[in-house]
């Protein structure tokens, strides 16, 4: 029972984990203009890992993808991976965690087959938090580095005269999305592995007997009924974020002049 | 379409106080932030401030910030500006402006003239 | 905060001709999340509030004629009327709608020769 338990719980919690991931990975505010002892702009910049957005004080927010490979920084490649290869791996684990739960019953599978795939989707689940947790992480020191690198370029200009005060970005949204998510991914598949320990069937000193009455063959096997059970997941994932560190309250998307009405 | 009601002309005493309202119409009141503008007879534009009509969150410049009180009435649809403790120097045209695309102000007000005279 | 500097301060023109003004801006206006510039051109008549010409620097407004152009980037813009027409006799204000307090130009007075 403590098995099935553990095993349930971490593949509930890795599935949050993963769709986390994606929602981090898809979020557009991994860095936010840093609006602290900043002069105050009129307008909001904020990045994702595919395109950078900007949104100004009249709710009217324009968003450009990133339509280059190689002009892009090598560190936002290699966060991108990390998140797609944290995406992918987790996603083939937790289609393998299904077929390992022990609460569904799959053809005549094997417990030692279920223990291997838990033990599998376990794995899984570990390295693509890690990745998860990696790919923020080195977008985080990327920012960190960045920060004060503008922070000491800031007030440089033209024979010593102001030109162009630079924008200085600081953590997104996405990036604690992406911390916690890994983190779950990372738990989830702690428990599977443990779980996994506890399926494993134990050697035993007798073999399956059978006993022959007549005109009837029936075999017994050591162990208990084990029910079958339907598992169905009706988990609607709607990508909901907010537009950061707004100096005003609620806006929201201008329309033409014309709509105004 | 968006119309921007204020009254014509105020006449006020040195010191005392005036409140001008703006009546907004023809577009989501509560969703665009209304800006206040000051100028002087033959003189040029000067920014106030600014109100969001939906939380009531104010950014003032500077210059006005003891001078003008920003407030609105989401009920009816209407801006308010205080002024306070006027002087001639604060004679002018106030206009009332929601933002438009690039923080610009596509809509103003007609301006309220307020003159003050003992 | 921003110093706004229009030039000339005055023009004097006849019907037909081209006329440029400019605005410098104290900082660069250019926000570069979306290499937009953040200046508006404003053109007003007498007893009457501004008239949105030019907003983003060079998008003109819904309505302006073409003979209104912006230009200019960073902190150097210029408002360009192809054609003047006996209308356009109005004082033009540039504003920098990027930095909080936003500032205007003194303004640039468009006259009869």
């Known amino acids: 029972m403590a098995v099935t338990a553990c095993q349930g719980l971490g593949f509930v919690v890795s599935l949050i984990g993963i769709a986390g991931i994606i929602a981090a990975t898809c979020m557009d505010q991994w860095s936010t203009q840093d609006l602290y002892n900043n002069p105050v702009t009129a307008v909001f910049n904020y990045q994702g890992l595919w395109r950078s957005c900007v949104r100004e004080s009249s709710g009217f927010t324009e968003c450009r993808g990133y339509f280059t490979l190689l002009g892009l920084p090598a560190m936002l490649q290699a966060v991108r991976a990390l998140m797609i290869v944290g995406i992918v791996l987790g996603a083939i684990g937790l289609l393998v965690s299904i077929f390992a739960l022990k609460c569904i019953r799959i053809g005549s599978m094997e417990d030692s087959a279920k223990a291997n795939m838990t033990l599998t989707s376990g794995i899984m689940f570990i390295v693509s938090g890690l990745c998860a947790i990696a790919g923020v992480s080195v977008f985080a020191n990327m920012l960190v580095t960045n920060f004060w690198m503008s922070t000491a370029n800031m007030y440089t200009g033209m024979g010593g005269m102001v030109q162009t005060v630079q924008t200085r970005y600081t953590f997104g949204a996405a990036l604690f999305v992406g911390w916690v998510a890994g983190g779950l991914t990372l738990i989830g598949g702690v428990m599977m592995c443990i779980a996994c320990r506890g399926l494993a069937p134990e050697e035993t000193n007798y073999k399956a007997v059978s006993y022959h009455a007549s005109g009837h063959s029936v075999a017994y096997k050591p162990g208990g009924f084990k029910a079958s059970t339907g598992f169905g997941s009706n988990t609607k994932n709607k990508k909901i974020y907010d537009g950061g560190a707004r100096t005003e309250d609620e806006v929201q998307s201008y329309p033409s002049k014309h709509d105004y009405v | 379409q968006v119309q921007l009601q204020q009254p014509g002309a105020e006449l006020v005493k040195p010191g005392a106080s005036v409140k001008l309202s703006c009546k907004a119409s023809?577009?989501?009141?509560?969703?665009?932030?209304l800006h206040w503008v000051k100028q002087r007879p033959g003189q040029g534009l000067e920014w106030i401030g600014m109100?969001?009509?939906?939380?009531?969150?104010?950014n003032y410049n500077e210059k006005f910030k003891t001078k003008a009180t920003l407030t609105v009435d989401k009920s009816s649809s209407t801006a308010y500006m205080q002024l306070s403790s006027l002087t001639s120097e604060d004679s002018a045209v106030y206009y009332c402006?929601?933002?438009?695309?690039?923080?610009?102000?596509?809509?103003w007000g007609q301006g309220t003239l307020v003159t003050v005279s003992a | 905060d921003i110093v706004m500097t229009q030039s000339p301060s005055s023009l004097t023109v006849t019907a037909g001709e081209k006329v440029t003004m400019s605005c410098k801006s104290s900082?660069?206006?250019?926000?570069?999340?979306?290499?937009?510039?953040?200046l508006t051109w404003y053109q007003q008549k007498p007893g009457q509030p501004p008239k949105l010409l030019i907003y983003?620097?060079?998008t003109r407004e819904s309505g302006v004629p073409d003979r209104f152009t912006g230009s200019g980037s960073g902190t150097d813009f210029t408002l360009t009327i192809s054609s003047v027409q006996a209308e356009d006799l109005a004082v033009y204000y540039c504003?920098?709608?990027?930095?909080?307090?936003?500032?205007f130009g003194s303004g640039t007075k468009l006259e009869k020769k």
């Open positions: 402006a929601p933002v438009y695309f690039g923080n610009s102000f596509a809509y």
């Open positions: 023809g577009y989501t009141f509560t969703s665009y932030l």
């Open positions: 109100i969001h009509p939906n939380g009531g969150s104010t």
């Open positions: 900082q660069s206006l250019l926000n570069s999340g979306n290499q937009k510039n953040y």
């Open positions: 983003w620097a060079s």
């Open positions: 504003q920098n709608d990027y930095y909080y307090p936003f500032t």
